[in-house]
């Protein structure tokens, strides 16, 4: 069967939408990639908490899945041939819409090792029991499936579209209904962000009365990274509610007119931005948002903030504290790397020393320089080492190799070098003869 | 390629109205904000108002606020800007320009010459 | 509204000779996204402006490489390396970040 959905969850900057249908992975993939995204990452714990919430909500809608214990894929795959590697997180899967390895695992068992064909993740969630936040859905790992026959208990898959940003969802200050239509081709009435070009159709009225007014608007960015329908003032107003309404559709203080009009206002410390319903900190660092060294830096506007970090730092997942940069895992050292709180230093291997073209270079230690020779007599540089060695008559001594000690020839391993009498000298040997003999021409024999 | 064609010059009377088309092509059109920036003989440059043609919002200058009116024709690829009230501080010559995905002002249309008698 | 200061008004220079110019803000360009939301542009004698360089320091297509922006949040300079008869023009600096969009005086490049 195709894919049905649908339940969708918009947040942060993300949409997840999970849909139900015996697909097998591949063909899941391509319905994701049809409406630009990939099947679903899950690369922490929130995210996590993000996905379960939209299966929560596609469970809700789904009279009876067929298995008690239902699998629902994500985008999580490891390529015929690529062996599993127990040490990572990951166990050598990778994310379909590429992207870095995280920390983050879930895993619902001991993987056991095949490289034989396609693997697969996905999530098994247990129906007989609640989807509850402490209980996240296990990563279940298997075949791939193939059309027709997507495998045992797949019941769905879940996608993930990212976006540049998201508008807040449209405030109607009357009775009205509100259609957005994503740009993944889903349509919702309820979404509590609303995805950069998504368009909104508002039909204001009761629904039976010919009276309905209709607005269309597009989320749109207005300004670098501040996204907003361009309404202004709330939707479907009408004197017979006033602000009894949705609070007339206002953020924060609704104020009537004798009329029958009214005005949104805002709460002290709080100002109201240009859609006339909405209300913003006047300044959100004032609450000191940012931890552990991190400066808070206002948006445009003085509508949003971000934290900042120093040099060496970025921020971790709350996207609020500053973590130390680990420099070290992009080797920018020669040799040996040390990271440090907010920077990192570069070290050399014995027999080196900094130096060299490029930064944290290592150059080789000219152990036998004039004045710094450690050999007693000769000195040959090497590669990160050097070696010494002696002049004829002496042989290399000492511990470390580097004295030269005089090589007793009368007593060479060769037995007596002279035929009579031996004396050893500082590097060489003279032979002798008794009294009454004479040394022969050759040096060694006596006549 | 994209291309932005204004309408021809125009000499009108002050405290009468003008209004100047901006014909764009090659790019899609309901996508990408048109900004109107208009130039007096011998000055700079002066942003006075946009829209999206997608869903026809407008942001105008507030120095021009209530004298000016933007309004697009998706059907023709169309923006049509319309100054009011006009006196001889408003001859200049007006642009139309495509705003890009990074904020920049990328593609001028050739300018349209206004010039207020009296 | 954010105000900017263009320095200087006129700037005459030598072929092959190096020229900058200089434009100040009244607030900071850099958004809490780590872009600055400054733009150069060109406008020859008789033409329409046309886009040099945008978010700072990044060519528009096409632009030479001669051509290059830098600065911080507030203070900028756009510097030609080698100026070419073809580049004379007044320059103008704008920043996009906050409505409404605001242009600098104008830099007139002229050849000696």
């Known amino acids: 069967t195709g894919a049905d959905t649908e339940a969708v969850v918009c947040v942060g900057t993300a949409c997840y939408t999970a849909h139900s249908g015996k697909l097998s992975a591949a063909e899941a993939q391509n319905h994701c990639n049809q409406n630009g995204g990939n099947l679903a990452t899950v690369k922490s714990k929130e995210e996590a908490q993000h996905v379960q919430r939209v299966l929560a909500q596609l469970l809700r809608r789904e009279a009876a899945l067929t298995a008690r214990m239902s699998k629902f894929w994500i985008g999580l795959q490891r390529e015929k041939g690529k062996c599993l590697d127990p040490s990572l997180p990951l166990k050598g899967f990778s994310w379909v819409g590429g992207g870095e390895d995280t920390p983050y695992s879930n895993w619902h068992k001991e993987l056991r090792n095949s490289c034989i064909s396609k693997r697969c993740v996905s999530l098994l969630l247990d129906l007989s029991q609640p989807l509850l936040p402490s209980r996240l859905p296990k990563w279940s790992e298997g075949p791939c499936g193939s059309p027709g026959s997507p495998g045992s208990n797949i019941e769905g898959f879940v996608c993930k579209f990212s976006f540049k940003g998201m508008c807040r969802p449209l405030a109607l200050g009357g009775p009205g209904q509100v259609t957005y239509t994503t740009p993944f081709q889903t349509t919702s009435s309820s979404l509590e962000a609303v995805p950069f070009a998504s368009a909104a159709n508002v039909a204001c009225g009761e629904g039976d009365k010919d009276e309905t007014q209709s607005h269309y608007f597009l989320c749109k960015e207005k300004a670098p990274d501040v996204f907003d329908w361009g309404s202004s003032g709330p939707l479907c107003v009408s004197p017979k509610y006033g602000c009894n309404f949705n609070n007339g559709g206002c953020h924060q203080d609704c104020f009537e007119g004798g009329d029958g009009s009214f005005l949104c206002g805002c709460r002290p410390g709080f100002r109201l931005l240009d859609d006339l319903v909405t209300c913003a900190s006047r300044n959100p660092c004032s609450s000191s948002p940012c931890r552990g060294g991190a400066t808070c830096v206002l948006g445009p506007h003085g509508k949003n903030y971000t934290c900042r970090c120093p040099q060496g730092y970025q921020l971790d997942s709350s996207q609020l504290d500053c973590v130390d940069v680990d420099e070290c895992q992009d080797s920018p050292c020669a040799q040996e790397c040390v990271n440090t709180p907010g920077g990192f230093r570069c070290e050399c291997w014995v027999g080196y020393e900094p130096g060299g073209p490029g930064e944290g270079a290592c150059q080789d230690v000219d152990e036998c320089a004039l004045g710094r020779s450690p050999c007693a007599q000769g000195c040959t540089n090497t590669d990160g080492s050097f070696h010494c060695s002696c002049e004829e008559g002496y042989v290399l001594a000492g511990e470390d190799g580097t004295q030269c000690q005089d090589v007793d020839e009368c007593v060479g391993p060769g037995g007596p070098l002279c035929d009579s009498l031996c004396f050893n000298t500082q590097g060489s040997f003279h032979c002798g003869c008794l009294p009454g003999w004479v040394l022969a021409p050759n040096g060694v024999s006596c006549t | 390629q994209v291309q932005l064609v204004q309408s021809g010059a125009e000499v009108v009377k002050s405290g009468a109205s003008v209004k100047v088309s901006c014909k764009a092509s090659?790019?899609?059109?309901?996508?990408?904000?048109l900004n109107w920036v208009r130039q007096a003989p011998g000055q700079g440059l002066e942003w006075f108002g946009r829209?999206?043609?997608?869903?026809?919002?407008?942001d105008y200058n507030g120095k021009f606020k209530g004298r000016v009116t933007l309004i697009r024709d998706t059907s023709t690829s169309t923006v049509y800007m319309e100054l009011t009230s006009l006196t001889s501080e408003d001859t200049a010559v007006y642009y139309c320009?495509?705003?890009?995905?990074?904020?920049?002002?990328?593609?001028w249309g050739q300018g349209t010459l206004v010039t207020v008698s009296s | 509204d954010i105000v900017m200061t263009q320095s200087p008004l006129s700037l005459p220079v030598t072929p092959g000779e190096p020229a900058s110019i200089s434009c100040r803000f009244s607030?900071?360009?850099?958004?809490?996204?780590?872009?600055?939301?400054l733009y150069w542009y060109l406008q020859k004698p008789g033409q329409s402006p046309q886009l040099l360089i945008y978010?700072?320091?990044n060519l528009a297509s096409g632009v030479p490489d001669r051509f290059s922006g830098s600065g911080s949040g507030t203070d900028f300079t756009l510097k030609i390396s080698r100026v070419e008869a073809e580049d004379v023009g007044v320059y103008y600096c704008?920043?996009?970040?906050?409505?409404?969009?605001?242009f600098g005086g104008g830099t007139k490049l002229e050849i000696k």
């Open positions: 607030q900071s360009l850099l958004h809490s996204n780590g872009i600055t939301y």
């Open positions: 320009v495509r705003g890009d995905g990074y904020w920049a002002m990328d593609y």
């Open positions: 978010q700072m320091s």
């Open positions: 704008a920043q996009n970040l906050e409505l409404p969009w605001t």
């Open positions: 090659g790019y899609a059109f309901s996508s990408y904000w």
């Open positions: 829209i999206y043609p997608g869903d026809g919002d407008t």
